[in-house]
């Protein structure tokens, strides 16, 4: 079996320029692969849509923190 995990590269080339209400968000993924032009966050909405956002923006970081807390509190 392979000794390392190979993950398909997903990149964000454009980011959303408006805030997504936190109640519409379901989860997020960090994009840090250096083969991508910029670090980014992909938010998944409750309708299943994936949206790229800029983690330098305050609302993005706040949304990530909020989702982290929700998921942590769901754990037994």
């Amino acid at each position: 079996q392979p000794d390392s995990v190979s993950i398909p590269i997903t990149c964000c080339f454009n980011v959303i320029n408006r805030k997504i209400p936190i109640q519409r968000l379901e989860s997020y993924t960090r994009i840090t692969n250096i083969q991508c032009p910029k670090e980014a966050v992909i938010f998944k909405t409750k309708r299943g849509k994936e949206v790229c956002a800029d983690p330098k923006e305050r609302w993005v970081r706040d949304s990530m923190k909020h989702l982290d807390q929700i998921f942590q509190n769901l754990k037994p």
Epitope: I34, K38, E39, P55, Q72
Partner: antibody
Framework: QVQLVQSGAEVKKPGSSVKVSCKAS????????MHWVRQAPGQGLEWIGR????????KFDPKFQGRATITADTSTSTAYMELSSLRSEDTAVYYC??????????WGQGTTVTVSS | DIQMTQSPSSLSASVGDRVTITCKAT??????LAWYQQKPGKAPKLLIS???SLETGVPSRFSGSGSGKDYTLTISSLQPEDFATYYC?????????FGGGTKVEIK
Amino acid sequence: QVQLVQSGAEVKKPGSSVKVSCKASGLNIKDTYMHWVRQAPGQGLEWIGRIDPANGNTKFDPKFQGRATITADTSTSTAYMELSSLRSEDTAVYYCARGVFGFFDYWGQGTTVTVSS
Amino acid sequence: DIQMTQSPSSLSASVGDRVTITCKATEDIYNRLAWYQQKPGKAPKLLISGATSLETGVPSRFSGSGSGKDYTLTISSLQPEDFATYYCQQFWSAPYTFGGGTKVEIK
């Protein structure tokens, strides 16, 4: 291929200042944060602070606030960290690293700063 | 500031051993934990972020687990190149803080 290349070793007198540079290639520093972390001989890692090169905004560990200055020149893709009022306890290897999210996936090779009278 | 307590500070192990390093935060850090490996004279290397996410190219014998305040790095079968010092780091809240390190030595 991302590379962070730092300036060479420095020997400084107590009370003086040191300025360390970190030149990035393979990435646009405007798209990330540039952090500075230090490691005293035989000790652990200590975060100093970071800059958003896109706008110059900085954040520091309160321990270094007022004594450390972090700047960036986006035209040369270079970040700088200056530490003033040096004392012997500042003898350490100083690293630059990149990362928006607060963890550090690419690091410079380190710059040794020795403070000695 | 959030303090990170890492244990043990050092351990001796043999090639093939299963090694576990723990990291405890003074408050809930919501999985915002990274693990690094550092070899003498070298910069740290990121192994894991988000408590469990293995960086690209990091061998699958490394794994991370935990939640809340308590986190673990496991090396399932220690290899010769794994003898190094390991650090945890929280990135929930600035100032970002590191554990004191765990030196993994050859028995």
